[in-house]
């Protein structure tokens, strides 16, 4: 189990009101065990909406760092290179789980937060306004 | 939170002993709550890189609905509409953390679990490889 | 099956720059799935971080405080190597030297694989 | 910095007895970036446990880890002849703040 003298403040994990709470085993299981994948490698380079990766950091947070994908360009890349103004590089967002320590600094109690990170970038027709 | 009827054979949530856990608020917070996004909207038409989007569905993980995308094609879509096989459509995959019940069905036992889903898609110029 | 062989001199004049290159076999330096970083192990000072390089997207630094002002970790890609300098040496830098890979799946952190070591003493 | 206070110094035990290694951090830390190496005279470290409780590769079920917070534990359930070695715990907690604790020495009695 886990000794950790209590922190005065902290909730009291034995606490049956203690409000909608669950008991979570932080042994983390890796559901993709058979393979190491270099989950999106390079693509930040060789996609027609190339990415650059920010460190977006915070020690209080499971986990400390993310990687956040910001697009290179408004427009995508042709096969010459140049940029097509005509297309748009837009991020693919996706909500993500993250562990906080609430109240901050508790050893043993955490809570879920929601973040919205992007991911990577696609290139898309953009969606033009006719204006009457 | 959840509200499920307790499972005799249940961990005891206020067991001192509970393998390494602790209490986790399930009260979600959501950082970015100043706008509720469209996240990807509708980026999974629009891109040169089109993707469906399948439902992911398991009662005992939280969350339970998972959308993971599938290319639709190998190349990508040209301004014509047709689809350039020069070119690779690929998924932007991302490891995110879920809560799975374990043991299975009971209400107040989690564990961590990290899964690997495919988020979107981007049009990727090929590596070519080539033979002596 | 990674490996790390390091290499440089063992003996360093105080003032002068210690430098050391460590050559990664079965793994890239610009692997997005790593960090390539030093650490340091003396009587005195137990084991030491003194900082790492990642790639993603464009290298990344992190340096230990205590030597932030002396060191740099460079990549070299075509050689599939990297160095660690430390400038105006003293007899306090004297330690067995590791280059090691860092797992930086940002679910978790630790040293796998690690170099053989390399004793650099300073000293006139 | 986070500072991670090992103790005992010295471990002194024999063959086949449980020997409990403490790592205390300064302040809270993730389990998940805490790791424990093994160090032989002469060689380099190895990573026995890594996320505080879980084994990395080859090493032996004897070895175990765990703990949350700024208190955690390696345990050796039956020391081998080969085990004794000093014991190293390690954290990262925010760049560029990665420390190591001064290590237990577990010997022969």
């Known amino acids: 189990g886990i000794a950790i003298p209590r922190n005065s403040g902290c909730p009291n994990s034995e606490d049956k009101n203690f409000p909608r709470t669950v008991m979570v085993n932080l042994n983390i299981h890796n559901r993709n065990t058979s393979t190491n994948p270099k989950r999106s490698s390079d693509y930040y380079n060789r996609s027609t909406s190339p990415w650059n990766l920010h460190r977006n950091e915070d020690p209080e947070r499971y986990p400390s760092v993310i990687w956040e994908a910001k697009c290179r360009h408004l427009g995508c890349v042709k096969a010459d290179g140049n940029v097509d103004y005509h297309m748009n590089s837009v991020p693919i967002q996706q909500e993500i789980l993250v562990l906080r320590r609430e109240p901050r600094h508790c050893p043993n109690s955490f809570r879920l937060e929601k973040i919205l990170v992007s991911v990577g970038c696609t290139c898309v027709t953009p969606i033009v306004h006719h204006v009457a | 939170g959840i509200a499920i009827p307790r499972n005799s054979g249940c961990p005891n949530s206020e067991d001192k002993n509970f393998p390494r856990t602790v209490m986790v608020n399930l009260n979600i917070h959501n950082r970015n709550t100043s706008t509720n996004p469209k996240r990807s909207s509708d980026y999974y038409n629009r891109s040169t890189s089109p993707w469906n989007l399948h439902r992911n569905e398991d009662p005992e993980r939280y969350p339970s609905v998972i959308w993971e995308a599938k290319c639709r094609h190998l190349g990508c879509v040209k301004a014509d509409g047709n689809v350039d096989y020069h070119m690779n459509s690929v998924p932007i995959q991302q490891e995110i953390l879920v809560l799975r019940r374990e043991p299975r069905h009971c209400p107040n036992s989690f564990r961590l679990e990290k899964i690997l889903v495919s988020v979107g898609c981007t049009c990727v110029t090929p590596i070519v490889h080539h033979v002596a | 099956q990674v490996q790390l062989q390091q290499s440089g001199p063992g003996l360093v004049k105080p003032s002068q720059t210690l430098s050391l290159t460590c050559a990664i076999s079965g793994d890239s330096v610009s692997s997005s799935s790593a960090a390539w970083g030093w650490i340091r192990q003396s009587p005195g000072r137990g084991l030491e971080w003194l900082g790492r390089?990642?790639?993603?997207?464009?290298?990344?630094?992190d340096y230990a405080v205590s030597v932030k002002s002396r060191i740099t970790i460079n990549p070299d890609t075509s050689k599939n190597q990297f160095s660690l300098q430390l400038n105006s040496v003293t007899p306090e830098d004297t330690a067995v030297y590791y280059c090691?890979?860092?797992?930086?799946?940002?679910?978790?952190?630790?040293?796998?694989?690690w170099g053989q070591g390399t004793l650099v003493t300073v000293s006139s | 910095d986070i500072v991670l206070t090992q103790s005992p110094a010295t471990l002194s035990l024999s063959p086949g007895e449980r020997a409990t290694l403490s790592c205390r951090a300064s302040?809270?830390?993730?389990?998940?970036?805490l790791a424990w190496y093994q160090q032989k005279p002469g060689q380099a470290p190895r990573l026995l446990i890594y996320g505080a409780s879980n084994r990395a590769t080859g090493v032996p079920a004897r070895f175990s880890g765990s703990g949350s917070g700024t208190d955690f534990t390696l345990t050796i359930s039956s020391l081998e002849p080969e085990d004794f070695a000093t014991y190293y715990c390690?954290?990262?907690?925010?760049?560029?703040?990665?420390?190591f604790g001064q290590g237990t020495k577990v010997e022969i009695k």
């Open positions: 090691a890979r860092e797992v930086d799946s940002t679910y978790y952190s630790y040293f796998d694989i």
């Open positions: 390089i990642s790639y993603r997207s464009k290298w990344y630094n």
């Open positions: 302040q809270n830390v993730w389990a998940f970036y």
């Open positions: 390690t954290q990262y907690y925010s760049s560029p703040s990665l420390t």
